[in-house]
Amino acid sequence: KFSKQSWGLENEALIVRCPRQGKSSYIVDWYYSQTNKSIPTQERNRVFASGQLLKFLPAEVADSGIYTCIVRSPTFNRTGYANVTIYKKQPDCNVPDYLMYSTVSGSEKNSKIYCPTIDLYNWTAPLEWFKNCQALQGSRYKAHKSFLVIDNVMTDDAGDYTCKFIHNENGANYSVTATRSFTVKDEQGFSLFPVIRAPAHNETKEVEIGENTNLTCSACFGKGAQFLATVQWQLNGNKITDFSEPRIQQEEGQNQSFSNGLACVNTVLRIADVKEEDLLLRYDCLALNLHGLRRHTIRLSRK
């Protein structure tokens, strides 16, 4: 299934894009997957479809579920799925992992924090920014367009940053928040040429046809916060995003720190419903930092 995960908070606006690529003006129909009931396009409804976009104004926990979008044309239709989860607002300041967008890293030279998903909304500047739930104040913080710039970044600037903005739809305003972690390059730390812990180079993994399997790419880059440290999978030398096989999905890298202080990153490649053709692909685990690139290759074989 060609699907995409989206999440939001109750009583906030959530806008989801159909995962099937299409241009503006294409005809897109949306349905509740469970009931096959069409989602209305009239803007007076709390949940309505607007071309490529599905709008929850505002979202409710009960909206959680899978939504089907069909890019229609007179001779050829394309179907995608949006997996939407709406969470209750947290009573305390803690933002759980499942509400976090991808982590960004910064340094004294580069401290931009982009507000996730904001491009989907009709918003006007300025954004409000919070760190660990406290409103950011002072001349060091500059809200610029859709990102936050921090001057003279220090290690204690690391933390969870939330952007808050107002989405306007036909004169009505809806709040939206999005949170992501910001890490700061630790001057006391150091970085090394990447070391891939798993998989071993030229490893072969046995899999069952029709089953699901996970491949973990795990690499370490040195001690302390790393300015650039990415771990990703490639298929036959292509990025996963370029390959666009919906059964094969790469999770965002998870940062890990070991007792010896090593900064490591794990990225999991999930392969659903393993097919014969997957056995012919070359799976490359790539670890990249400022020192260079290391690659370990793994192949799949039938059990």
Epitope: S25, Y26, S73, P74
Partner: antibody
């Protein structure tokens, strides 16, 4: 980035079958789009021939239906054109192209085919 | 089959002037509020490149001097102001039904 590349024999004798291959890189042909064959005759006229969709469904130009087939090899991310009983009228540049239900977005560079004895 | 007739077959336009190319369909290519007409540019030795989709929408990366209009059976591609690099052949194409067909093409020469 999606890239398509046609390959074929260049020269075919009349009454024989023509087989062309389109190799797609940067995108899986089973994940989206319809994968088409389009030809351009020496006078520049363009003709859509047929497609195979991401799900494996096919559709053909009725003018060619009796002698065309489009198949694929998902393990190699390739799709193929077979045209039977060719005549000199089938001399053309053959393009493969992706189709999103609306327009042909990505095209190969084309391969020239001459039908001659 | 829907026959697309392009006119003129060729035209020569001075730099900075307007080029207008017409495409007429033998039956309507519009349905449910959308016109399934597309325009492509082709330069020698290259495949066609999409310029305009759904009659009037500019494809990403295409200069704003290209514009499309029309509905039903009559469609127009305009280029203004014409530039040196616009010398090429232009084709209309419909996707209203199978078979998809193309117009005969219009060759634009820059004077």
């Amino acid at each position: 980035e999606v890239q398509l590349q046609e390959s074929g024999p260049g020269l075919v004798k009349p009454s024989q079958s023509l087989s062309l291959t389109c190799t797609v890189t940067g995108f899986s042909i089973t994940s989206d789009y319809a994968w088409n064959w389009i030809r351009q005759f020496p006078g520049s006229k363009l003709e859509w021939m047929g497609f195979i969709s991401y799900s494996g469904d096919t559709s053909f130009n009725p003018s060619l239906k009796s002698r065309i087939s489009v198949t694929r090899d998902t393990s190699k991310n390739q799709f193929f054109l077979q045209l039977n009983s060719v005549t000199t009228e089938d001399t053309a540049t053959y393009y493969c192209a992706s189709y999103d239900g609306y327009s042909f977005d990505y095209w190969g560079q084309g391969t020239t085919l001459t039908v001659s004895s | 089959d829907i026959v697309l007739t392009q006119s003129p077959a060729s035209l020569a336009i001075s730099l900075g002037q307007r080029a207008t190319i017409s495409c007429r369909a033998s039956k309507s290519v519009s349905t449910s509020g959308s016109s399934y007409m597309f325009w492509y540019q082709q330069k020698p030795g290259q495949p066609p490149k999409l310029l305009i989709y759904l009659a009037s929408n500019l494809e990403s990366g295409v200069p704003a001097r290209f514009s499309g209009s029309g509905s039903g059976t009559d469609f127009t591609l305009n280029i203004h102001p014409v530039e040196e690099e616009d010398a090429a052949a232009y084709y209309c194409q419909h996707s209203r039904e199978i078979p998809y067909t193309f117009g005969g093409g219009t060759k634009l020469e820059i004077k």
